[in-house]
C-alpha cells in the first residue's frame, strides 16, 4: 500500500470520558494536523477510517460499528459512543485516505469509572475566580454537540456530593452556575449532570470543574520585600556563616511570572568568585498570593565578603523592587560597603 503520513500517537490529547455516558470524539487530524476541514476532505473524495488498539494489546483492529443500538457510530469526523464501556479504553486512530493520499493520527482514550460522589481519576479543568468580585459564572463544559438546540436537557449542579439548593451565594441557572461575591470557602469541585433524551433513551453527561478563588486584580501590587530591611544588620566575624534571607510577597496576578534574585556588588551570584549557596522556597496563601524566600549563605565569610553589597531583587508584572542587606564586620562601625 501507499506510504501514509503518520502523525504518531497524539499524547497532547489524553481524552478521558466517563463510563456509561455518551462520548463524541472528533478526529484530531482536522483540528491540529491538516489545513483543511472534514467537509473539504470529504468533497475531495477522501474517506475517514477509524480503528483502534485495545489497552495492553498491540494489534490494531477495526472498530465494530454493528453493535446493538448503534453503541459506537461515526458521523462525519466524530466517533460516537452511546454510551461508553470500560473496555473501550485504548488508542484510537483516524485515517484520511484515497488511492493516492493517506494521513493518520492516533490518540489515547481512557474510559474512567466514577463513584456516586463523582470521585474518579478524571483530570478536571480549573476555573480561577477573583475573590470578592461581583458575579462569576461557570458554564457546564464540553456538552456542545450532544443534543440539538431543540432539546432542553435537565441540569443538576453539585458541590462535591451535595446538590446545590439554597446555597447562599451560589445559584444554578441551567447550564450556568453563578457565584456572588465569592469567598475562599467556595473552593471545590462543582459537577453538572446533564440529562437528555435521545431515541427513547435517557443519557447523562457528567462534567466537573474545580473552582479556585484567587486574589483580585484590584489588590495586585508590585513585589513587597519583607527581608532584608533597614532594621536588621547582619553583623559577622570572619569565618562565621553569613545567612541572609530575601523574603518577598507577591500578590496573586493571573499568569504573572514572579522572580527573585540576589546580586553581589551588582553581579549575579554565578558571576562572583565567592562560594555562595542559594536555596529557594515558596509558600502560598489561600488566595494564591505567593511568598518566595531565597536564602543566601556563605559558609565561611571573609572580611572582603563583609564589605560586599548584597541586594535582593524582585519582579512581577506590576513592577520591580530591590533592597540591600546591611552587612558589617563585628567591631567595625561601618555599615556601608568599605572602599579601600
Amino acid at each position: 500500500s501507499e506510504r501514509c503520513d503518520d502523525w504518531g500517537l497524539d499524547t497532547m490529547r489524553q481524552i478521558q470520558v466517563f463510563e456509561d455516558e455518551p462520548a463524541r470524539i472528533k478526529c484530531p487530524l482536522f483540528e491540529h494536523f491538516l489545513k483543511y476541514n472534514y467537509s473539504t476532505a470529504h468533497s475531495s473524495g477522501l474517506t475517514l477510517i477509524w480503528y483502534w488498539t485495545r489497552q495492553d494489546r498491540d494489534l490494531e483492529e477495526p472498530i465494530n460499528f454493528r453493535l446493538p443500538e448503534n453503541r459506537i457510530s461515526k458521523e462525519k469526523d466524530v466517533l460516537w459512543f452511546r454510551p461508553t464501556l470500560l473496555n473501550d479504553t485504548g488508542n484510537y486512530t483516524c485515517m484520511l485516505r484515497n488511492t493516492t493520499y493517506c494521513s493518520k493520527v492516533a490518540f489515547p482514550l481512557e474510559v474512567v469509572q466514577k463513584d456516586s460522589c463523582f470521585n474518579s481519576a478524571m483530570r478536571f479543568p480549573v476555573h480561577k475566580m477573583y475573590i470578592e468580585h461581583g458575579i462569576h459564572k461557570i458554564t457546564c463544559p464540553n456538552v456542545d454537540g450532544y443534543f440539538p438546540s431543540s432539546v432542553k436537557p435537565s441540569v443538576t449542579w453539585y458541590k462535591g456530593c451535595t446538590e446545590i439548593v439554597d446555597f447562599h451565594n451560589v445559584l444554578p441557572e441551567g447550564m450556568n452556575l453563578s457565584f456572588f461575591i465569592p469567598l475562599v470557602s467556595n473552593n471545590g469541585n462543582y459537577t453538572c449532570v446533564v440529562t437528555y433524551p435521545e431515541n427513547g433513551r435517557l443519557f447523562h453527561l457528567t462534567r466537573t470543574v474545580t473552582v479556585k478563588v484567587v486574589g483580585s486584580p484590584k489588590d495586585a501590587l508590585p513585589p513587597q520585600i519583607y527581608s532584608p530591611n533597614d532594621r536588621v544588620v547582619y553583623e559577622k566575624e570572619p569565618g562565621e556563616e553569613l545567612v541572609i534571607p530575601c523574603k518577598v510577597y507577591f500578590s496573586f496576578i493571573m499568569d504573572s511570572h514572579n522572580e527573585v534574585w540576589w546580586t553581589i556588588d551588582g553581579k549575579k551570584p554565578d558571576d562572583v568568585t565567592v562560594d555562595i549557596t542559594i536555596n529557594e522556597s515558596v509558600s502560598y496563601s489561600s488566595t494564591e498570593d505567593e511568598t518566595r524566600t531565597q536564602i543566601l549563605s556563605i559558609k565561611k565569610v571573609t572580611p572582603e565578603d563583609l564589605r560586599r553589597n548584597y541586594v535582593c531583587h524582585a519582579r512581577n508584572t506590576k513592577g520591580e523592587a530591590e533592597q540591600a542587606a546591611k552587612v558589617k564586620q563585628k567591631g567595625n562601625g561601618c555599615t556601608e560597603p568599605m572602599t579601600l
Epitope: E132, H133, I135, H168, F180, I181, V184, K218
Partner: antibody
Framework: EVQLLESGGGLVQPGGSLRLSCAAS????????MGWVRQAPGKGLEWVSA????????LYADSVKGRFTISRDNSKNTLYLQMNSLRAEDTAVYYC???????????WGQGTLVTVSS | EIVMTQSPATLSVSPGERATLSCRAS??????LAWYQQKPGQAPRLLIY???TRATGIPARFSGSGSGTEFTLTISSLQSEDFAVYYC?????????FGQGTKVEIK
Amino acid sequence: EVQLLESGGGLVQPGGSLRLSCAASGFIFSTYGMGWVRQAPGKGLEWVSAISYDGEGTLYADSVKGRFTISRDNSKNTLYLQMNSLRAEDTAVYYCARFRYYTAFDYWGQGTLVTVSS
Amino acid sequence: EIVMTQSPATLSVSPGERATLSCRASQSVSSNLAWYQQKPGQAPRLLIYGASTRATGIPARFSGSGSGTEFTLTISSLQSEDFAVYYCQQYNNWPWTFGQGTKVEIK
C-alpha cells in the same frame, strides 16, 4: 480617616418604604465591598446585605430577601439600602460597614434608627 | 447557615482581672472569625480578625485564638473602658453570622 455616615432612617408604617444612604470618605470606596448590619433594640447584630466593590454582586439575609435592595454609586462614594414592604420586625439601628475578605467589617458608621410602627 | 454561639452570656469581672470569652461555630470557619466590641449607644468596633490578628489601634491586652469551630477572646487585664458587649462573627461563608454577644460587666 475612614468615615461612614448613615442617613435616611425614621418612623414608617408597616408596608411602607424607606431608603437609607451611607456616605463614605477617607478611603478608596470603589475598592471595598460594603454591607448593612442591623441591631434591633436590646438585641444582637444581624447581617442584612452585602454588595461587591464593583456593585455587580449582591447578597441578602433570608429575612429581607425580595424586600430590600442594596446598591452603590462609586462616583458619589455612597451606599444605599432601599427597604420596601417594611415590617415591625425590621425596626432596628442600621449600620453600614465596609468589608474585606480577610478583615470582615473593619469600619462602621454610627447607625441610623428605623422604626416600623403604626 | 453557620450558627455562632457565645458563652457565657454575661461575665462579671473585676478591673485588672483576666476575662476569657468563648465562641463556637456550628461548622468549621477556618480562621475567618472576627471579634467586635460594642459600648451602649455606639457602633461596633473591630478588635480581632483572622481569629488572632489585632485590628489597627487595638491594645495588646486583647488577644484572640482558635481555629475551626472553637475560638477565644482574652482580655488580659480589664480596664474600665473594656466593660462592653463583645460579639464574634464568622466571615468564612455567606451569610456572615454573629454570635448573640457576651456582656462583660463590672463585678
